[in-house]
């Protein structure tokens, strides 16, 4: 009897183990005792990335401008084309199907990371002695003014969105 | 260890007969077909035989069909080639090769080999 | 039966070099080819099979490229234990053929 399973990147059909078509081609006909699997290379808008059976190729993805997408790396016979977001958006999905604006961090927040093709931004909250009074996704936190340094006094003291005010010392006469 | 070990080569008159042994070790023998390969002196490889996992599957070269016979013992992990009326012109090393495949004697590749044994016919 | 050849017959280069081989087939094969090496009184080893799959061990400098009917061995930079010679064959029909072999010499 025929056996049940065929070594790796091979098929059983007909009592044949069939080798697979190799990534970036497609199956044409199955082996038979005397000829091997017929296989033909995927065109040049297609591809197939794995040891396959397949009898057609799949089409690369399509980065829609229209959608905010634009083309990271071409695709090959054996890759699809990888698609990311235009400048100012970032993908929706790990597949990366449509784009969305980044996010700003609002007042009292700072951008712990910038925003990529394929992530949004990071906020952080602003800790004790630092600061941020925009709406940005670009902005870090920022330090507190030093009122020493400059030789002057905290007269209005800093939150989480707002800076210290400096004013001078009380001179004693 | 993985290995082939053919033996029964030797110098043989023409028209007389001999028998080749490959011995098998390492690899589960009856999970792939098996072949002959032979090289004349200081010539290119020639595929002689192949014999699938089964024996159900069985071919030859041209050159030598109706002379040799494959065959190979699972039990034993031995693949055996009976050569008769040999002709000068079967003069060669004659390896036995593993093919990572299983279903036909016909086609197929090598991806383990003997170190082979000298056949000379020769008066 | 399909015919291989083999070009060139043999090729003198130094340690360092790359070396190309060529294999042309007398009917498409897809990619159903292998390439092997032999030195003097051993036996044939695999490199490559499916035109472009390295075989386990082997080393990366070692590449196959092509489909159909043309395919290409190359070696990117020859070391002193590749001087042998090299070997094509198609498994895409009956029966399996070789070509002539390429003889890799030192220049």
């Known amino acids: 009897e025929p056996p049940t399973a065929c070594r790796e990147k091979q098929y059983l059909i007909n009592s044949q183990c069939c080798s697979l078509c190799q990534p970036g081609q497609k199956l044409v006909s199955d082996c038979t005792e005397f000829t091997e699997t017929e296989c033909l290379p995927c065109s040049e808008s297609e591809f197939l990335d794995t040891w396959n059976r397949e009898t057609r190729c799949h089409q690369h993805k399509y980065c829609d401008p229209n959608l905010g997408l634009q083309v990271q790396q071409k695709g090959t016979s054996e890759t699809d084309t990888i698609c990311t977001c235009e400048e100012g958006l970032h993908c929706t999905s790990e597949s990366c199907e449509s784009c969305v604006p980044h996010r700003s961090c609002l007042p009292g927040f700072g951008v712990k990371q910038i925003a990529t093709g394929v992530s949004d931004t990071i906020c952080e909250p602003c800790p004790v002695g630092f600061f941020s009074n925009v709406s940005s996704a670009f902005e870090k936190c920022r330090p507190w003014t030093s009122c020493e340094t400059k030789d002057l006094v905290v007269q209005q003291a800093g939150t989480n969105k707002t800076d210290v005010v400096c004013g001078p010392q009380d001179r004693q006469r | 260890e993985v290995q082939l070990v053919e033996s029964g080569g030797g110098l043989v008159q023409p028209g007389r007969s001999l028998r080749l042994s490959c011995a098998a070790s390492g690899f589960t023998f009856d999970d792939y077909a098996m072949h002959w390969v032979r090289q004349a002196p200081g010539k290119g490889l020639e595929w002689v035989s192949g014999i699938s996992w089964s024996s159900d599957s069985i071919h030859y070269a041209d050159s030598v069909k109706g002379r040799f016979t494959i065959s190979r013992d699972n039990a034993k992990n031995s693949l055996y080639l009976q050569m008769n009326s040999l002709r000068a012109e079967d003069t060669a090393v004659y390896y036995c090769?593993?093919?990572?495949?299983?279903?036909?004697?016909?086609?197929?590749?090598?991806?383990?080999w003997g170190r082979g044994t000298l056949v000379t016919v020769s008066s | 039966d399909i015919q291989m050849t083999q070009s060139p017959s043999s090729v003198s280069a130094s340690v360092g070099d790359r070396v190309t081989i060529t294999c042309r087939a007398s009917k498409v094969i897809s990619s159903w080819l292998a390439w092997y090496q032999q030195k003097p009184g051993k036996a044939p080893k695999l490199l490559i099979y499916a035109a472009s799959y390295l075989e386990s061990g082997v080393p990366s400098r070692f590449s196959g490229s092509g489909s159909g009917t043309d395919f290409t061995l190359t070696i990117s930079s020859l070391q002193p234990e590749d001087f042998a010679t090299y070997y094509c064959q198609q498994h895409s029909s009956f029966p399996p053929t070789f070509g002539g072999g390429t003889k890799v010499e030192i220049k």
């Open positions: 090769a593993k093919d990572p495949t299983a279903t036909t004697g016909a086609r197929g590749y090598f991806d383990l």
